[in-house]
Amino acid sequence: SPQNPGCPNAEDKNFPRTVMVNLNIRNRNTNSKRASDYYNRSSSPWNLHRNEDPERYPSVIWEAKCRHLGCVDADGNVDYHMNSVPIQQEILVLRREPRHCTNSFRLEKMLVSVGCTCVTPIVRHVA
Amino acid sequence: SPQNPGCPNAEDKNFPRTVMVNLNIRNRNTNSKRASDYYNRSSSPWNLHRNEDPERYPSVIWEAKCRHLGCVDADGNVDYHMNSVPIQQEILVLRREPRHCTNSFRLEKMLVSVGCTCVTPIVRHVA
């Protein structure tokens, strides 16, 4: 239940558009079973690419790229009747406002690929 | 390349701990191929659960739960020699500071499951 039940939700129209944000992260050491434990052993394996941008917070984001078009079968062969596809997620990042060395940021949505999964394509035969 | 090459990175120790953030999101309508296109057709299908918290921004986050312990084979049967596992990602959210109806927030790390992938476990026999 909310700590402040009468407060406007940050997504409400009447909520202030500019807020103060403390950058000392809570839950800094979140115990994560890293997706990277899975990137090699998945039937839709992926590589991780570093996306760096000093004008963004966080400045480093890791992006997944599927290693194959198809999926790896039990014998280690790629089966092209299945597809390796990226699982994407929208995340929020802070983008520095363009005035010189300002402490002002703006929320920005980013679409990132987190890992890959193996899907059965819908097959259509063209007449 | 950075707009302001001489500016301290927001992750530097000497960067101010409190910054101003504009909540008018850039790239609000990011064109995303939703992971939800895949949640039913994956060999490691998942369901999406709504995680709502009015003290957080964004207040609604969707979490994936793998539908099976094993993975779905070409015939639609679950193969328990493989594992459906959640792909997790650390994301940043804004947590409202606990003073009544404040416009102050703090960055918080959250570990979210975005979707599932199918992995082959290494088998060990216990003596």
């Epitope: 899975y38 | 594992n83 596992v85």
Partner: nanobody
Framework: EVQLVESGGGSVQAGDSLRLSCAAS????????FGWFRQTPGKEREFVAG????????EYANSVKGRFTISRDNAKNTVDLQMDSLKPEDTAVYYC?????????WGQGTQVTVSS
């Protein structure tokens, strides 16, 4: 290293009940799921039941659904399989399985014999 200790196997009559237990010790952290497979001579090991550690979600083979119940004790790292209304076709060696997502540990097995 991980150790698995299975107990509770034996011989019973059709319609009777039996309870299998499996305790994990050693470096059994980051458990994905815990459960049981079984094997009869000349056949492949088949999945019986499993319980996911994070949320206690359970899954059963169709052949045992409604008769077998899997449960866990998080604090003790144990999993139990309550087997009711046993049938002769449930006769097999039952193997405890501890799954850590990318590594899976198999116990040595315990014999269950159901006679008609």
């Amino acid at each position: 290293e991980v150790q698995l200790v299975e107990s509770g196997g034996g011989s019973v009559q059709a319609g009777d009940s039996l309870r299998l237990s499996c305790a994990a010790s050693g470096r059994a952290n980051s458990i994905n799921w815990f459960g049981w497979f079984r094997q009869t001579p000349g056949k492949e090991r088949e999945f019986v039941a499993g319980i996911r550690w994070s949320d206690a979600y359970t899954e059963y083979a169709n052949s045992v659904k409604g008769r077998f119940t899997i449960s866990r004790d998080n604090a003790k790292n144990t999993v139990d399989l309550q087997m009711d209304s046993l049938k002769p076709e449930d006769t097999a060696v039952y193997y405890c399985v501890l799954d850590l997502s990318t590594v899976r540990y198999w116990g040595q097995g315990t014999q269950v014999t159901v006679s008609s």
